[in-house]
């Protein structure tokens, strides 16, 4: 099924994400005690570290090309607040499209 196929993509994306976060932390002078939001892999896509008040935008992740190969990919955002990251806006399905009736094969 498509979800099983996505596992390999995710492992590769996650490894790339952790490298990206490390580089971004060095560039921005971020460490564990820095105010702001640490970079993270949320099991769907990669979010770079951000300062409080910053909005981070990402393109829809690769997973949704499997769900909807013909769909133009949208954009998802998270806000970095004093309490940490907000949840994605819009949620992934709303931003990236989801065909409820597409087969799983």
């Amino acid at each position: 099924g498509s979800m099983a196929h996505s596992d390999g993509i995710f492992k590769k994306e996650q490894a790339m994400c952790l490298e990206k976060i490390q580089r971004a932390n060095e560039l921005m002078g971020f460490n564990d005690s820095s105010p702001g939001c640490p970079g993270m892999w949320d099991n769907i896509t990669c979010w770079k570290p951000a300062h409080v008040g910053e909005m981070v935008l990402v393109s829809c992740p690769e997973l949704f090309r499997i769900f909807n190969p013909d769909q133009d990919m949208g954009v998802v955002s998270r806000n970095c607040t004093e309490d940490g990251w907000s949840e994605p806006f819009p949620h992934y399905f709303d931003a990236c499209g989801f065909d409820e009736y597409e087969s799983e094969t």
């Epitope: 949320d42 099991n43 769900f67 949840e87 949620h91 709303d94 799983e104």
Partner: antibody, heavy 120, light 107 residues
């Protein structure tokens, strides 16, 4: 059509455990996040927990953290809520709901609920 | 956690009247605010998503507005089947939360 059927509710003594199940049909269960939401008799809705499509992300309300565990079996199209150290204030109708997302999302379809009564 | 406050707690109106329900968040939730209707003995039903987006199958008399901390659900002309409890729900910050509800009853 989307159908969610909860089971496993009942009367239980304080401090004991109970496991709720939610059988899903009418949609591709393995692609959606799932929520548990509860409603005490005559009261409002209280969000309890959510689990991502693959079970990799789980989040809980403060009131149940450390006592309740959300899980899923995608091969059986079933969502679970393991409830330990139950208290009188956990007495409620427990709804399972589909989250319109892979990660969390907002509940878009709901079951009819299963009643949990915690009483000595 | 983000606390949602709904007002009024009860709204007594007659069929045909306009209903205006308010939901206020203790911190900004952007537009990640959703509205549900619950009738006695039934599960909640999603009415409006992302503050103002309508859903297929939901009558056009239901509309939503707002962003940040202040939101409104409007029922333009109450039908007998609209008398119910209405809840707002935020999915902007974990843990997610619901408002305490507004009961719309018949005057």
């Amino acid at each position: 059509q989307v159908q969610l059927v909860e089971s496993g509710g009942g009367v239980v003594q304080p401090g004991r455990s109970l496991r709720l199940s939610c059988a899903a049909s009418g949609f591709t269960f393995s692609r959606f996040a799932m929520h548990w939401v509860r409603q005490a008799p005559g009261k409002g809705l209280e969000w309890v927990a959510v689990i991502s499509y693959d079970g990799g992300n789980k989040y809980y309300a403060e009131s149940v953290k450390g006592r309740f565990t959300i899980s899923r079996d995608n091969s059986k199209n079933t969502l679970y809520l393991q409830m330990n150290s139950l208290r009188a204030e956990d007495t409620a109708l427990f709804y399972c709901a589909r989250g319109y997302d892979v990660l969390t999302g907002y509940p878009d379809y709901w079951g009819q609920g299963t009643l949990v009564t915690v009483s000595s | 956690e983000i606390v949602l406050t709904q007002s009024p707690a009860t709204l007594s109106l007659s069929p045909g009247e306009r209903a205006t329900l308010s939901c206020r968040a203790s911190k900004s939730v952007g537009r990640s605010l959703h509205w549900y209707q619950q009738k006695p003995g039934q599960a909640p039903r999603l009415l409006i998503k992302y503050a103002s987006q309508s859903l297929s199958g939901i009558p056009a008399r239901f509309s939503g507005s707002g962003s940040g901390t202040d939101f409104t659900l409007t029922i333009s002309s109450l039908e007998p089947e609209d008398f119910a409890v209405y809840y707002c729900h935020q999915s902007s910050r974990l843990p997610f939360t619901f408002g305490p509800g507004t009961k719309v009853d018949i005057k």
